[in-house]
C-alpha cells in the first residue's frame, strides 16, 4: 500500500549522482528504512538501541547511506536513463510504538544535465 507521495524534496542531484532522502519522525528511536525501486529492494538500513542506549546500525542490502536524527539518505551514483523509475521509502517504526509501516515515494526523472558522463 502506498501511503502517499513524499511531502518534501526527495531527490537531490549532484556530481552525476542522486541523493534520495527518506524522512522519519525524529521521535523515532528504532526503525528499518528500505529504499525500493519499483517493487525491488535496493537498500536497507536498520537502527536499533540496546541496553545503555547503545545504537546499532545494520544493512542487509548495503548502499552508501547517511543517517541523521530525522532522515536516511541513500546515494546512487553514475546515473543513466535506466535509473528513471518510481522510488519509495519503506519505513517500519519499531520504537516508540505503535508499530507502523509507511510507504512514500516519487518518480525520479533523469535529464541529460544530470547524467554523470555527458558526451561533449
Amino acid at each position: 500500500e502506498i501511503n502517499g507521495s513524499a511531502n518534501y524534496e526527495m531527490f537531490i542531484f549532484h556530481n552525476g549522482g542522486v541523493q534520495i532522502l527518506c524522512k522519519y519522525p525524529d521521535i523515532v528511536q528504532q526503525f528499518k528504512m528500505q529504499l525500493l525501486k519499483g517493487g525491488q529492494i535496493l537498500c536497507d538500513l536498520t537502527k536499533t538501541k540496546g541496553s545503555g542506549n547503545t545504537v546499532s546500525i545494520k544493512s542487509l542490502k548495503f548502499c552508501h547511506s547517511q543517517l541523521s536524527n530525522n532522515s536516511v539518505s541513500f546515494f546512487l551514483y553514475n546515473l543513466d536513463h535506466s535509473h528513471a523509475n518510481y522510488y519509495f521509502c519503506n519505513l517500519s517504526i519499531f520504537d516508540p510504538p505503535p508499530f507502523k509501516v509507511t510507504l512514500t515515494g516519487g518518480y525520479l526523472h533523469i535529464y541529460e544535465s544530470q547524467l554523470c558522463c555527458q558526451l561533449k
Partner: antibody, heavy 121, light 106 residues
C-alpha cells in the same frame, strides 16, 4: 473503548514532588508510547516527554530535564509522571496522551481527562 | 525551539460562517496537527499530517499548508465548534504547540 484515566487533583508545597498516574484501558498498553503534556492556567500546552512502554525508552523536553521522570507499570497498564522541586509556576493541568503515527508525523490520538496540580505554600 | 504563532488570537464569528485559522512556524516543519479544546476538557485531535481528518471529526474541518504556513478551515460553523484551537508540530525537538486561537460566537 480506548480510555486514559488520570489520578485526582493534588495540592503541593514548593520544593516537594508530585506523581500523577494515567491508567490505560481498551487497548494493549505495551503497543503504544505515552506522552505527558501540561497546561498552566490560561496558558497554552507544553510537551513534557514520553515513554515507550515496551522498551522503557524515555525522551524529555530539556526544559524539564532532571526534574521530570516518566515511568510505566506494565502489570497495571499505568504510566506515571513525577515532577520534583516544584515551584509555583508548575501549577497546571497535566495530561497524558497516547502516541500514534500518520504517514509523516506523530501525534497524540487519545488524551486523559487531566490532573490539576496546584503548588502553593 | 520552533515557535508556532497562531492568528488571530480571537476570532468572532456566527454559526454558518467560514472560519480560517492560521499557524505560522518560526522555521520549516514537515507537517502540522490541530487540536480543539473546550473549557474544562482535554484537547481533542482534529487534523493530523497537515490535512488528514481524525476519526469521528466532521468533514467541515480541513487543514492545509506546508513549510512555515498552515491553515485550519471550518467551512460552516456549528454551535459546538466554538472552542480554542491549537496547532502542534512534532517535526523539531522540543515539540511545540501554538498559543491557541479562541473561536467565539459573535
Amino acid at each position: 473503548q480506548v480510555q486514559l484515566v488520570q489520578s485526582g487533583a493534588e495540592v503541593k508545597k514548593p520544593g516537594s514532588s508530585v506523581k500523577v498516574s494515567c491508567k490505560a484501558s481498551g487497548y494493549t498498553f505495551t503497543d503504544y508510547a505515552m506522552h505527558w503534556v501540561r497546561q498552566a492556567p490560561g496558558q497554552g500546552l507544553e510537551w513534557m516527554g514520553l515513554i515507550s512502554i515496551y522498551s522503557d525508552h524515555t525522551n524529555y523536553n530539556q526544559k524539564f530535564q532532571g526534574r521530570v521522570t516518566i515511568t510505566a507499570d506494565k502489570s497495571t497498564s499505568t504510566a506515571y509522571m513525577e515532577l520534583s522541586s516544584l515551584r509555583s509556576e508548575d501549577t497546571a493541568v497535566y495530561y497524558c496522551g497516547r502516541n500514534n503515527y500518520g504517514n509523516y508525523g506523530w501525534y497524540f490520538d487519545v488524551w486523559g481527562q487531566g490532573t490539576t496540580v496546584t503548588v502553593s505554600s | 525551539e520552533i515557535v508556532l504563532t497562531q492568528s488571530p488570537a480571537t476570532l468572532s464569528l456566527s454559526p454558518g460562517e467560514r472560519a480560517t485559522l492560521s499557524c505560522s512556524a518560526s522555521s520549516s516543519v514537515s507537517y502540522m496537527h490541530w487540536y480543539q479544546q473546550k473549557p474544562g476538557q482535554a484537547p481533542r485531535l482534529l487534523i493530523y499530517d497537515t490535512s488528514k481528518l481524525a476519526s469521528g471529526i466532521p468533514a467541515r474541518f480541513s487543514g492545509s499548508g506546508s513549510g512555515t504556513d498552515y491553515t485550519l478551515t471550518i467551512s460552516s460553523l456549528e454551535p459546538e465548534d466554538f472552542a480554542v484551537y491549537y496547532c502542534f508540530q512534532g517535526s523539531g525537538y522540543p515539540y511545540t504547540f501554538g498559543q491557541g486561537t479562541k473561536l467565539e460566537i459573535k
